[in-house]
């Protein structure tokens, strides 16, 4: 999906109002220095591409993020403010229901969410630069 035509201001508002709080709650008990940020993004559409990938694509050591509250809110936000995004998710939703797994917060998942926080902050910064 090409995130170029999203309403970035509206996405930023949703992130600041609610998604950020859920990400921080997920990370509670860990320090910001516990993980190094290895994933970056260069512009707003690129940031959203990386955020989508890290949030919804299961990895061998962290398969359960898509069911977290911040992930559900991220999906809702993208579906709302990115034209045509919802139709790309119809089949993806069915596949996700089939592979539903037990929720386990592993260190790898914490690291992945730490990367997500970094990507979202980068998204906000690139937005501020444009303004």
């Amino acid at each position: 999906y090409d995130f170029t035509n999203c309403d970035f201001q509206k996405i930023e508002a949703d992130y600041l109002r609610t998604i950020s709080k859920d990400l921080i709650t997920y990370m509670s008990g860990t320090k910001s220095t516990d993980f190094n940020n290895t994933v970056s993004c260069s512009n707003r559409p690129h940031c959203l591409t990386e955020i989508q990938s890290l949030t919804f694509n299961p990895t061998p050591r962290c398969a359960s993020l898509a069911k977290e509250m911040f992930a559900r809110k991220t999906k809702a936000t993208l579906a709302l403010w990115c034209p045509g995004y919802s139709e790309t998710q119809i089949n993806a939703t069915q596949a996700m229901k089939k592979r539903r797994k037990r929720k386990v917060t592993t260190n790898k998942c914490l690291e992945q969410v730490s990367q997500l926080l970094g990507l979202w902050r980068r998204f906000i910064r690139t937005l501020l630069k444009k303004q």
Epitope: D7, A13, D14, R17, R72, K73, W81, S86, Q89, I90
Partner: antibody, heavy 120, light 107 residues
Framework: EEKLQQSGDDLVRPGAAVKMSCKAS????????MHWVKQRPGQGLEWIGT????????DYNQNFKGRATLTADKSSNTAYMELSRLTSEDSAVYYC?????????????WGQGASVTVSS | DIVLTQSPATLSVTPGESVSLSCRAS??????VHWFQQKSNESPRLLIK???QSISGIPSRFSGSGSGTDFTLNINRVESEDFSVYYC?????????FGTGTKLELK
């Protein structure tokens, strides 16, 4: 079974405001946005706006911005629409309709409609 | 805003005939079009989602096709209960919009 129960019909004066409700049952309230649609007698469907309980956010058709206010009470699974500064043009049937925000993405259940008559 | 134009405005048919209703978008909207039926004094009812996907409980005589800007609702062998108004709707981008409607009436 998913159900949307709307409040009753209303007769209101021009310039006044009306607040209607839409009580949801049979599904997880926060998994869906609540949309509001206007239909004047013998006319088509006009999208007013939506409230997304999961995100506590709303969006409006420009034609209704500033006059329509969409809210929801998550504890009672009820969505509300308040329409202010009413004129005769607002005499219509108003529908609420749910739409999935993390799946489905379509208005698959509708309320029975609430008729508003604006008259002095 | 995306404008949806439906044609014809009115379609007069006899039961048993097959009909096609058209919905044209003012800009490409992929497959983000849904079809609703509205009978007199009733709420709209979802018939087809995302241009061609069927809905549970809807008779198989209703089908949809199209993508981009041109969409079609087909009714195979119209039955008496099908006489009503049909609307297309786009959810490609906000604000969501409805088509102008097509009234299917008895000839």
């Amino acid at each position: 079974e998913e159900k949307l129960q709307q409040s009753g019909d209303d007769l209101v004066r021009p310039g006044a405001a009306v607040k209607m409700s839409c009580k949801a049952s049979g599904y997880i309230f926060t998994d869906y946005a609540m949309h509001w649609v206007k239909q004047r007698p013998g006319q088509g469907l006009e999208w007013i706006g939506t409230f997304i309980p999961l995100l506590d956010t709303s969006d409006y058709n420009q034609n209704f911005k500033g006059r329509a206010t969409l809210t929801a009470d998550k504890s009672s699974n009820t969505a509300y629409m308040e329409l202010s500064r009413l004129t005769s043009e607002d005499s219509a049937v108003y529908y609420c309709a749910r739409m999935g925000v993390t799946h489905s993405y379509v208005m698959d259940a509708w309320g029975q409609g609430a008729s508003v008559t604006v008259s002095s | 805003d995306i404008v949806l134009t439906q044609s014809p405005a009115t379609l007069s048919v006899t039961p048993g005939e097959s009909v096609s209703l058209s919905c044209r978008a003012s800009q490409p909207i992929s497959i983000s079009v849904h079809w609703f039926q509205q009978k007199s004094n009733e709420s709209p009812r979802l018939l087809i989602k995302f241009a061609s996907q069927s809905i549970s409980g809807i008779p198989s005589r209703f089908s949809g096709s199209g993508s981009g800007t041109d969409f079609t609702l087909n009714i195979n062998r119209v039955e008496s209960e099908d006489f009503s108004v049909y609307y297309c709707q786009q959810t490609f981008s906000l604000p969501y919009t409805f088509g102008t409607g097509t009234k299917l009436e008895l000839k």
